[in-house]
């Protein structure tokens, strides 16, 4: 990752994608250390920005405005050279977000996938963006960029992610840009959590008082395992919501979560998954499906779950 013999390496922390008003640290790594350095912004000329100021270790830039978007380079201090400075570093593009209306982000076939599968993340907008960028939360590398395609009054781009491994699980957002200001990105799409299943042993799922209940009777689904899962996730077939609960250690050395569904009104097929706090978007194999049947007078659906939806929030820790 480091630059060549006389070429420093310029990087940004926490990310090259910075919201308007946010801050970003630019680090110029030169000759196995952070020495004094100068920064250049490649706008109209290669003159040092910030009035030729010299920085040590890192420069915290912000609060950023759209004018900060662009390509940066640095030169490291080299006292015994002719100029006193190294060759220019690699180019580093800083992108500033929040400059256009947010696009939409969808996952095909869905956000819950088995290890080894491929998912298409489709970013689209009627703003007709020329380029779309896909960024995973917590990653400092540049986002993936694709040229949009126009279809039926919207522009869209399909990002192919896979084969899926635990490192690719996480929270994704996409952005759009237009030619006038290609590094001034839109507001972020709503976050989309990509969850990878099938990595650990499946938990077991049971129903109390049983899988067949009278209409109006209270039902609780219990998910348990010998594995020390921190969180259990309960999903119902055909529903975009998942519920999650912290696992509780039991006296029989299992780890269990009890999901109260309330008074039974409608049947359904349920599955549960376990996950660990350190990797909240990497889940176990699915439990065997559990069909809950309601006898009597079923109405349209269960009460709305009070837990977070699976659309976002899965990949954040449960506090």
């Amino acid at each position: 990752l480091m630059g060549g013999q006389d070429k420093p390496f310029l990087s940004a922390r926490p990310s090259t994608v910075v919201p308007r008003g946010g801050h970003v640290a630019l680090q110029c790594h030169y000759r196995r250390g952070f020495n004094n350095f100068m920064l250049y912004k490649e706008d109209r000329s290669h003159v040092p920005i910030f009035h030729g100021r010299i920085f040590q270790e890192s420069f915290i830039m912000g609060p950023v405005t759209p004018a900060h978007a662009g390509t940066y380079r640095c030169r490291g201090s080299r006292p015994h050279s002719l100029t006193g400075w190294s060759a220019p570093s690699n180019p580093l593009v800083i992108m500033v977000t929040g400059n256009h209306r947010k696009p939409s982000l969808l996952a095909h076939p869905g956000p819950l996938l088995k290890s080894g599968e491929t998912v298409i993340l489709q970013c689209w907008s009627d703003v007709m963006f020329e380029h779309f960028f896909l960024h995973r939360e917590g990653i400092s590398e540049d986002p993936s960029r694709l040229v949009g395609q126009i279809h039926d009054g919207v522009s869209k781009a399909n990002f192919s992610i896979g084969p899926l491994m635990p490192v690719l699980a996480g929270t994704y957002r996409c952005y759009g840009s237009v030619p006038h200001s290609p590094y001034q990105l839109s507001a972020p799409s709503d976050p989309l959590d990509i969850v990878i299943t099938g990595l650990y042993e499946k938990p077991s799922l049971s129903a109390q008082p049983g899988p067949t209940v009278q209409a109006g009777e209270n039902v609780t689904l219990s998910c348990s395992s010998w594995s020390s899962y921190d969180i259990y996730h309960l999903s119902r077939e055909g529903e975009a919501h998942e519920r999650r609960l912290r696992a509780v250690p039991k006296v029989n050395r299992t780890f269990q979560a009890d999901f109260p569904l309330g008074p039974a009104t409608h049947g359904g097929t349920y599955r549960c998954f376990g996950s660990f706090r350190a990797l909240p978007c990497v889940w176990s194999n699915s439990s065997d499906p559990l069909l809950v049947s309601v006898t009597g007078n079923p109405s349209s659906s269960w009460p709305s779950p009070t837990e977070p939806s699976s659309k976002s929030g899965i990949c954040r820790h449960l506090h």
Partner: antibody
């Protein structure tokens, strides 16, 4: 259909102020930025700058910093160009032109507003 | 600023002939994102300009395939294979890669 309709011709004296409007219709106004382009009599086109209709942020070319101001009335889908302290060299036709977000710059243009500056 | 130089100033042609417009930029106009934002506009007498070609060689919607754009770096060309009466007017090249964006001085297409 998409249209940009500009206000009518203006006759002003040096030192006065003019405000030219550009009313957009047929699309979501805040989805596409708006540019202003100057054309002096018998001359070519000169890009003055643009305004981001989503954030309201203007960008001015160096020659148009100071006396020139871009503004918006988003609820009326209208962009404005105001020129203060008018000078003889401001006499020109001014066009508004929509940002073509998808790889091009000006996909729809207003019909132009002719500004005459004369004492 | 990037200076866009267009030649010739005036281009007399006969209807049905080919017309070729040249545009040269004072510096490379490849944007750091890899795109070359070079466009061609036609301004017919008494009208607003209209977009013909974007990103060097892409025809804008509704533009006849008689129009084509080519070039790279600093040298660009617009060609009309068979000139029709409706093509008359002033042709401007434009660069949108470096702020401030700049137009060429224009080439007037007229009938011989």
């Amino acid at each position: 259909q998409i249209q940009l309709v500009q206000s009518g011709p203006e006759l002003k004296k040096p030192g006065e102020t003019v405000k030219i409007s550009c009313k957009a219709s047929g699309y979501t106004f805040t989805n596409f930025g708006m540019n202003w382009v100057k054309q002096a009599p018998g001359k070519g086109l000169k890009w003055m700058g643009w305004i981001n209709t989503y954030t309201g942020e203007p960008t001015y070319a160096d020659d148009f910093k100071g006396r020139f101001a871009f503004s918006l009335e988003t609820s009326a889908s209208t962009a404005y160009l105001q020129i203060n302290n008018l000078k003889n060299e401001d006499m020109a036709t001014y066009f508004c032109a929509r940002n073509g977000n998808f790889g091009y710059y000006f996909d729809y243009w207003g019909q132009g507003t002719t500004l005459t500056v004369s004492s | 600023d990037v200076l866009m130089t267009q030649t010739p100033l005036s281009l007399p042609v006969s209807l049905g002939d080919q017309a070729s417009f040249s545009c040269r930029s004072s510096q490379n106009i490849v944007h750091s994102n890899g795109n070359t934002y070079l466009e061609w506009y036609l301004q017919k007498p008494g009208q607003s300009p209209s977009l013909l070609i974007y990103k060097v060689s892409n025809r804008f919607s509704g533009v006849p395939d008689r129009f084509s754009g080519s070039g790279s770096g600093t040298d660009f060309t617009l060609k009309i294979t068979r000139v029709e009466a409706e093509d008359l007017g002033v042709y401007y090249c434009f660069q949108g890669s470096h702020v401030p964006f700049t137009f060429g001085s224009g080439t007037k297409l007229e009938i011989k």
